[in-house]
């Protein structure tokens, strides 16, 4: 569904301003911060969401080992530059003219430089590893049940096609969800794994981006699945370029 016509809100993004000023008086929603029109029938891009967040008031064994090229978002929040489609621009700079290159999920993939830094292309993050630790339960979850419910969650809540959920690993209390999506696999209209992972991350933190929906309440055969910590690793189609100084720090 598009923006809800009756009360003109955006079901998939509460960080919007909506008004019935679209064609034929239809409800149209614009992201805070950028003012860009968003499609409320799908997830909003992470770049627009980060920009909106920065503009908002501040109060408002079988397990996979991440590869040596995996990135973790250690830099935290920044006010990104987004292209007209809402994607991250390959080069990001702050107010003090410090610049760096980012991948398609907006995570820095080079050392920081000055305005002369070149970022030739936006490198795609094609593999995301979401590493969760759940709170203690009476017993371990059944792996097959867990797989079924997490797939359902990504399919139903984030509209991510099941083929992009590559695997769900479980070794109590650690759950790992692998999302994979190459450039060639992503068709028009497909939700991006980076956007799905970001919505999931915010849901897990109790900061749902959905309008009016309750927070994430995930249960497996009636047993609540409560997450106590999350780590997300990002793997790019082209390995990141950091100096040895950073790697040995």
């Amino acid at each position: 569904h598009t923006a809800a016509q009756d009360n003109c809100t955006c079901p998939t993004n509460k960080m919007t301003v909506c008004s019935p000023d679209g064609p034929g008086g239809r409800c149209q929603c614009r992201a805070l911060g950028s003012g860009m029109a968003v499609d409320c029938s799908t997830l909003t891009s992470k770049c627009l969401l980060l920009k909106a967040r920065m503009s908002a008031p501040k109060n408002a064994r079988t397990l996979v080992r991440p590869s040596e090229h995996a990135l973790v978002d250690n830099d935290g929040l920044y006010d990104p530059d987004c292209d007209p489609e809402g994607r991250f621009k390959a080069r990001q700079c702050n107010q003090t003219s410090v610049c760096w290159c980012v991948n398609s999920v907006g995570v820095r993939r080079t050392d920081k430089g000055d305005l002369s830094l070149r970022c030739d292309e936006l490198v795609r993050t094609h593999h995301i590893l979401i590493d969760l630790r759940h709170r203690p339960t009476a017993g371990a979850f059944n792996h097959s049940d867990l797989d079924a419910e997490l797939r359902r969650l990504f399919r139903e809540r984030y509209r991510l096609h099941p083929k992009f959920v590559a695997a769900v690993h479980y070794e109590q209390p650690t759950i790992q969800i692998e999302l994979r999506q190459n450039t060639s696999q992503k068709a028009a209209g497909d939700v991006d794994i980076g956007d799905a992972a970001y919505y999931f991350e915010r849901d897990i933190k109790g900061e749902s981006l959905f309008q009016g929906r309750g927070g994430l309440d995930l249960r497996v055969r009636g047993e609540p699945l409560q997450v106590e910590r999350t780590l997300i690793y990002y793997l790019d189609e082209i390995p990141p370029k950091f100096s040895m100084k950073r790697l040995t720090a």
Epitope: S144, D147, E149, R151, R152, R155, V165, A167, G214, R219
Partner: antibody, heavy 117, light 111 residues
Framework: QVQLQESGPGLVKPSQTLKLTCTVS?????????WNWIRQPPGKGLEWIGY???????LYNPSLKSRVTISRDTSKNQFSLKLSSVTAADTAVYYC??????????WGQGTLVTVSS | DIQMTQSPSSLSASVGDRVTITCRAS??????????LHWYQQKPGKAPKLLIY???NLESGVPSRFSGKGSGTDFTLTISSLQPEDFATYYC?????????FGQGTKLEIK
């Protein structure tokens, strides 16, 4: 033992709204699982209509989405189906069923709804 | 939508026969640890009854003469030795993608 029981009118006029209720006993619908409606036209196969989850989230079959609403009343441990603008093609046996982890382990006995003037 | 195709559409067999019904999905319904394919039995005037879930798991209370196997797109339901109460219509169902979809059914009749 979990039991599901459908109830509602057996005859609905074309263009009207079909309303059915499923009463669940032996399990609280807000404690877990997904609570579904499935239908079967006479002599034909099964068609999934949609569900409401333990937390109140909905998912509908896109082929019926514009006409379907599934809601719940947790105080009565019931969930309901509304199907608007019905035609003769909506004549079917309507089942409610529990979806455990994406398969249906408990079913109601079904109720036949005929759409006719 | 994922299309589920069962074969044969109908089948005549005798008590004691071994019978196999096939279900083919238009795309894979398997994950790394799951096969989202389930089998149901339906008798006239009754609700479907779950027989096998996730391709090969026998539902509690279902006789061991029923078995299922397969992965990806191709699945089978086998009844090792038909009993009189087994004459019914059988449906497969996928739950890898929404909307959930069922096969058209296989009617098992007495020869």
């Amino acid at each position: 033992q979990v039991q599901l029981q459908e109830s509602g009118p057996g005859l609905v006029k074309p263009s009207q709204t079909l309303k059915l209720t499923c009463t669940v006993s032996g399990y609280s619908i807000s404690s877990g699982y997904y609570w579904n409606w499935i239908r079967q036209p006479p002599g034909k196969g099964l068609e999934w209509i949609g569900y409401i989850s333990y937390s109140g989230r909905n998912l509908y079959n896109p082929s019926l989405k514009s006409r379907v609403t599934i809601s719940r009343d947790t105080s009565k441990n019931q969930f309901s189906l509304k199907l608007s603008s019905v035609t003769a093609a909506d004549t079917a046996v309507y089942y409610c069923a529990r979806d455990t982890t994406a398969y249906f382990d408990y079913w109601g006995q079904g109720t036949l709804v005929t759409v006719s003037s | 939508d994922i299309q589920m195709t069962q074969s044969p559409s109908s089948l005549s067999a005798s008590v004691g026969d071994r019978v196999t019904i096939t279900c083919r999905a238009s795309e894979s319904v398997s994950s790394s640890v799951n096969r989202f394919l389930h089998w149901y039995q339906q008798k006239p005037g009754k609700a479907p009854k779950l027989l096998i879930y996730r391709a090969s798991n026998l539902e509690s209370g279902v006789p061991s003469r029923f078995s299922g196997k397969g992965s990806g797109t191709d699945f089978t339901l086998t009844i090792s030795s038909l009993q009189p109460e087994d004459f019914a219509t059988y449906y497969c169902q996928q739950s890898n993608e929404d909307p959930y979809t069922f096969g058209q059914g296989t009617k098992l009749e007495i020869k």
